[in-house]
């Protein structure tokens, strides 16, 4: 009785179960009654990452420097190349096919989370008592200067974009 289903890592062909090729190898010829499945290793810059019956290996992804990409992890015969973005850029999608510059947090906003190769800068508004007077992809909101600890008084209150201005205690208004 010919089989209708095969074991794991096998496939059904011509009413018989043949072994799949292991990751990193492609199928050259199916097994027969008398011979095993014939597989060949993938060539340079090719890969197959599963047990398979593919007759052609996949090309490694190309990390195009013109798109701001660089190799994060070199591909093997069993794994694809992983691309990431150059410094100051991050991927536009999960598959990282191209890169865009990190955004800066505008004055009045600070960096909540610094960008990585795969995620953009996350900004947050500076709350009362904190300020940011720069556009930056790295700077957090900074606390207002404490005039009191310097034996000074506030001459001008701070805002989310400016620090307080301190002055001498005896200032006449």
């Amino acid at each position: 009785e010919p089989p209708t289903a095969c074991r794991e890592k096998q496939y059904l062909i011509n009413s018989q179960c043949c072994s799949l090729c292991q990751p990193g190898q492609k199928l050259v010829s199916d097994c027969t009654e008398f011979t095993e499945t014939e597989c060949l290793p993938c060539g340079e810059s090719e890969f197959l990452d599963t047990w398979n019956r593919e007759t052609r290996c996949h090309q490694h992804k190309y990390c195009d420097p013109n798109l701001g990409l660089r190799v994060q992890q070199k591909g093997t015969s069993e794994t694809d190349t992983i691309c990431t973005c150059e410094e100051g850029l991050h991927c536009t999608s999960e598959s990282c096919e191209s890169c865009v510059p990190h955004r800066s947090c505008l004055p009045g906003f600070g960096v909540k989370q610094i960008a990585t190769g795969v995620s953009d800068t996350i900004c947050e508004p500076c709350p009362v008592g904190f300020f940011s007077n720069v556009s930056s992809a790295f700077e957090k909101c900074r606390p207002w200067t404490s005039c009191e600890t310097k034996d000074l008084v506030v001459q001008q209150a701070g805002t989310n974009k400016t620090d307080v201005v301190c002055g001498p205690q005896d200032r006449q208004r």
Epitope: K112, Q113, E124, G129, C141, E148, V153, Q156, A157, R173
Partner: antibody, heavy 122, light 113 residues
Framework: QVQLVQSGAEVKKPGSSVKVSCKAS????????IEWIRQAPGQCLEWMGS????????NYAQKFQGRVTITADTSTSTAYMELSSLRSEDTAVYYC???????????????WGQGTLVTVSS | DIQMTQSPSSVSASVGDRVTITCRAS????????????LAWYQQKPGKAPKLLIY???SLQSGVPSRFSGSGSGTDFTLTISSLQPEDFATYYC?????????FGCGTKVEIK
Amino acid sequence: QVQLVQSGAEVKKPGSSVKVSCKASGYTFSTSWIEWIRQAPGQCLEWMGSILPGSGSTNYAQKFQGRVTITADTSTSTAYMELSSLRSEDTAVYYCARGDDGSYVRWYFDHWGQGTLVTVSS
Amino acid sequence: DIQMTQSPSSVSASVGDRVTITCRASQSLLFSVNQKNYLAWYQQKPGKAPKLLIYWASSLQSGVPSRFSGSGSGTDFTLTISSLQPEDFATYYCQHYYSYPWTFGCGTKVEIK
């Protein structure tokens, strides 16, 4: 202890102005923000603006910008809130409250005045 | 401006009941640098000024009974009265102090059932 004592009730005509005072005691007046909040009958609390008496720095809610003036006299530890071009919708209880004390961590209002009822009626 | 939305607008309860009031902000009130939520809760009785109960979302103001507690983070906050007392029948307001202009919720009135 901290105390904020406000001026008495006022009845005003539409188009006129009102000036409410808030006398502070029991803390350093010049280094603590004074906040002004109003509450129309049956309405939500509405922040109007604030002043840091020692510097004269002010913040105003956009809704009241140009119509409200907040001032302070450090010699008498008194803050003032003047509202001009009064209309009937300005009928409300006006409160002063103490805000941050210069520590930059006490922005909530821990002490309030008793409130001043301003009635605008022709 | 940050909008503050309170619910419910009123609640009927009996002495001894557990009462929960919620407040939602239109943007996060949590600041990553100090991990503080810029939110306060006040109690107001008819004809009186509001009274501070809770600040930094969960810190109990000195002199306020421990049956009052605040919780939540980011945009969603809760004021809980664990066992309602006769003197707790009042209107409760949340307020943010993250950035100008400060804004309040429109209040939750706790009434006698």
